[in-house]
């Protein structure tokens, strides 16, 4: 209209959905009396009343703002509650007189997105692809207005870069006004991409100002070819005969090509494949010496059909061979002297050690024992172990028994055995002799013989206690070719004095042993005895 | 709209190969990655094999020497052969639609059911 | 391989029953999981993607929820056509399917 002058802009009024705009209607009281005001909305340049001041009172008009318009401020101020992404327009308030003029109000609507989803391409990317791939979705959920997508990787921005980087973004919205924006990031990777760290972030703007929100890292599996194989030996070090060895391929490619791993046949040279667990490793267990040798794998990408083949690596599993005593079964007269000679072969060096079986004692670090003007008491168990000290645990032992001509040699002479009447009674009676002797028994009963060692025989006797035989007592005797010799048990009933009080009288008189290490005695007395020490 | 369709021989023969074919209509394969399924009777579903929109192939380790998927773009067509065929492959064969910004399947077909026996 | 375990196998409920399906990954899927519904003689059918987002034309009945290892799909009220077989598939990392729980009609 000629002479008009040109409508201001009108006045912002930004707020977050869900809450109340509260329009003030900015006439001043010579513009228009605010007792008598209407109240438009402006969709597609198309206004609507909405609400009706009169002498100060409020009126909604019937529509889609009926319900949530009030009057505030002495009715200078239009509240609208529970906004919604369709009420981003312009409202206008109109006095009415003195003569009409109008106030114009901009609503802004705004609403923070939902946490940006990232999803990675599950199947990855391979390096040699014509053009970029996908490497990653992400979608930010119900937003007002559409938020805006950027994608980084390490860090940082990703931009648009031709034939190397796309972004396709694209929104749609929801039933409820609010955006839903998805995004997807295209890109070519090379190999160094397999750590990189890729994110996206939504920009978006509130009444208080701007925001983002950023999605959690993810990385991308990225498939490049196999340049190098190479071959991996568990445990690291020095290997041994025994252990557990592993032996596995590996590749700097992914997926990792098909491995074999062979071994090269020391007399015809030829490399032959050797047979792999499902995982592709060559367990050895236990290693053993013809393990070793000389070892490499091939690796086979299915794609390409390249093979790829590694540096050998030779496999030495140390070893120590069985231990060889001479003599073998040495037998010598008491008085006389013998050397025993220990041999073995290994992959390192060996150090020889002999010890007594009996004691553990070491008598002699060197593979030669010299034994002088033996004794009975020198016959028994002589052990050489031969070790490699560099390796700990690689060792290999052997028994030799030393025999002492000699007659029957008694464990004890005689010896105290406290019964009671009826009861079963265990005796046992050792001897040692070279030849080794056998046992006999004066009286009646179930007797069984054990070897203990080449010299030594122990004897066990179960008997029923009666009159007679506490009486007479029991003896046993051992013979060989060289003599015989007698041990004798002297049978005690027990009173119940000799009792300790904490003692089981019913079962713990039901046996009782005679043996050579402990002492002659039904098992419910603590009574010490004396033990006789003479014992030839 | 969209829609996909396979079609394939029916009946195979123990250590043949199968071809099956996908015809795809309302959408372009060089906007979206196509996959095959498949399910044995009464069983479950299995990833097969898929073609991205820019072309890579991807196939299931469990299978992957003896599949090859391809496409043609202009036929709209996406190709599936599996050579070596055992009665285990019998299985009603499905081809599946990703979703442009997601890595769900958004569209199937009603599948093919494919029978390995002599 | 990511395993899929679904529970139950078989569910039988009536129309108007609220019913929940049970969902478990081997290992950690954060949210890249969908549900599906296969009626018998067609193609699977998407529900629900990301593991709590509706697909468009899905009704409202039907909802998804869980992250990391447990998942779980919610029909509110059955219907008489939600009869069927509903599989959960992860993309995390590959494609692998649980082997389905089917819906009967108790």
């Known amino acids: 209209v000629p002479g008009e002058a040109e409508q201001p802009a009108p006045e912002l009024v930004e707020v977050e959905v869900g809450s109340t705009a509260l329009l003030k209607c900015g006439l001043s009281q010579s513009q228009g009396n605010l007792s008598h005001v209407d109240w438009f909305s402006v969709h597609k340049e198309k206004r609507t009343l909405i609400f009706r001041v009169r002498q100060g009172q409020g009126q909604s008009e019937p529509g889609e703002y009926e319900q949530r318009l009030s009057l505030q401020d002495r009715g200078a101020t239009l509240a609208l509650t529970q906004v919604t992404p369709q009420d981003e327009r312009i409202f206008l308030c109109q006095g009415k007189r003195p003569r009409s003029q109008e106030y114009r109000i901009q609503l802004r609507v705004y609403k923070a997105p939902e946490e940006p989803n990232i999803q990675v391409n599950p199947l990855g990317i391979p390096v040699n692809s014509k053009e970029p791939e996908e490497v990653a979705t992400c979608v930010g959920r119900n937003g007002y207005p559409i938020p805006q997508v950027i994608w980084y990787k390490n860090g940082r921005p990703l931009k648009e870069e031709k034939n190397r980087v796309h972004i396709q973004s694209s929104q749609t919205v929801e039933s409820s006004g609010l955006y839903t924006l998805q995004s997807i990031l295209k890109a070519q990777l090379v190999k160094e991409d397999k750590d990189a760290q890729f994110y996206c972030e939504l920009n978006y703007r509130l009444p208080s100002g701007n925001h983002m929100k950023e999605s959690r890292e993810v990385t991308v599996p990225v498939f490049y070819p196999t340049e190098k194989v190479w071959l991996e030996v568990e445990p690291v070090g020095m290997l041994k005969e025994g252990d557990r060895v592993e032996i596995r391929c590996l590749a700097d490619g992914n997926p990792p090509p098909h491995f074999s791993i062979s071994k090269q046949n020391p007399s015809t040279r030829e490399a032959e494949e050797e047979t792999t667990n499902d995982n592709g490793v060559l367990v050895l267990e236990p290693a053993r010496k013809e393990h070793s040798g000389r070892y490499e794998c091939q690796g086979l990408d299915l794609d390409t059909m390249i093979s790829l083949l590694s540096e050998p690596q030779e496999l030495l599993v140390n070893y120590v061979s069985d231990v060889r005593v001479s003599p073998a079964a040495p037998e010598r007269q008491e008085g006389s002297s013998l050397t025993l000679t220990c041999e073995a072969e290994s992959s390192q060096d060996l150090e020889f050690q002999w010890l007594r079986e009996e004691t553990g004692q070491v008598l002699e670090r060197g593979p030669v024992l010299q034994l002088h003007d033996l004794k009975r008491e020198a016959g028994g168990g002589y052990r050489c172990v031969a070790s490699v000290p560099s390796i700990p645990g690689l060792n290999r032992t052997q028994l030799v028994n030393v025999a002492i001509f000699g007659p029957p040699w008694m464990a004890f002479k005689e010896r105290k055995v406290w019964v009671k009447e009826n009861m079963v009674l265990n005796l046992s009676c050792e001897a040692s002799g070279h030849p080794r002797p056998t046992i006999s028994w004066n009286v009646n009963g179930t007797a069984s013989e054990q070897d203990q060692d080449p010299q030594r025989v122990l004897s066990t006797l179960n008997v029923l206690v009666t009159p007679e035989l506490l009486e007479t007592g029991v003896e046993c005797t051992a013979s060989n070719d060289l003599g015989k010799n007698t041990s004798i048990l002297f049978l005690e009933l027990v009173n119940l004095t000799t009792l300790t009080p904490d003692s089981n009288t019913t079962t713990g008189l039901s046996t009782s042993t005679a043996s050579p290490h402990t002492r002659a005695n039904s098992t419910s007395t603590e009574r010490k005895l004396p033990e006789p020490e003479s014992r030839g | 709209q969209v829609q996909l369709k396979e079609s394939g021989p029916g009946l195979v023969q123990p250590s043949q190969t199968l071809s099956l074919t996908c015809t795809v209509s309302?959408?372009?394969?060089?906007?979206?990655?196509v996959s095959w399924v498949r399910q044995p009777p009464g069983k479950g579903l299995e990833w097969i094999a898929a073609?991205?929109?820019?072309?890579?192939?991807y196939y299931n380790s469990a299978f992957k020497s003896r599949l090859s998927i391809s496409r043609n773009t202009s036929k709209s067509q996406v190709l599936l052969k599996m050579n070596s065929l055992q009665t285990e492959d019998t299985a009603m064969y499905f081809c599946?639609?990703?979703?442009?910004?997601?890595?769900?399947?958004?569209?199937w077909g009603p599948g093919t059911m494919v029978t390995v026996s002599s | 391989d990511i395993r899929m375990t679904q529970s139950p196998s078989l569910l039988s409920a009536s129309v108007g029953d609220r019913v929940t399906l049970n969902c478990k990954a081997s290992?950690?899927?954060?949210?890249?999981l969908a549900w599906y519904q296969q009626k018998l003689g067609e193609g699977p059918k998407v529900l629900i993607f990301?593991?709590?987002s509706l697909q468009t034309g899905i009704p409202s009945r039907f909802s998804g929820s869980g992250s990391g290892t447990d998942f779980t799909l919610t029909i509110s009220s059955l219907q008489p056509e939600d009869f069927a077989t509903y599989f959960c598939?992860?993309?995390?990392?590959?494609?692998?399917f649980g082997a389905g729980t089917k819906l009967e009609l108790k």
């Open positions: 290992q950690n899927i954060y949210n890249s």
């Open positions: 598939q992860q993309f995390y990392s590959g494609y692998t």
């Open positions: 073609i991205s929109s820019g072309g890579t192939t």
């Open positions: 599946a639609r990703r979703y442009g910004y997601g890595w769900y399947f958004d569209f």
């Open positions: 990301n593991a709590n």
């Open positions: 309302g959408f372009s394969l060089t906007s979206n990655g």
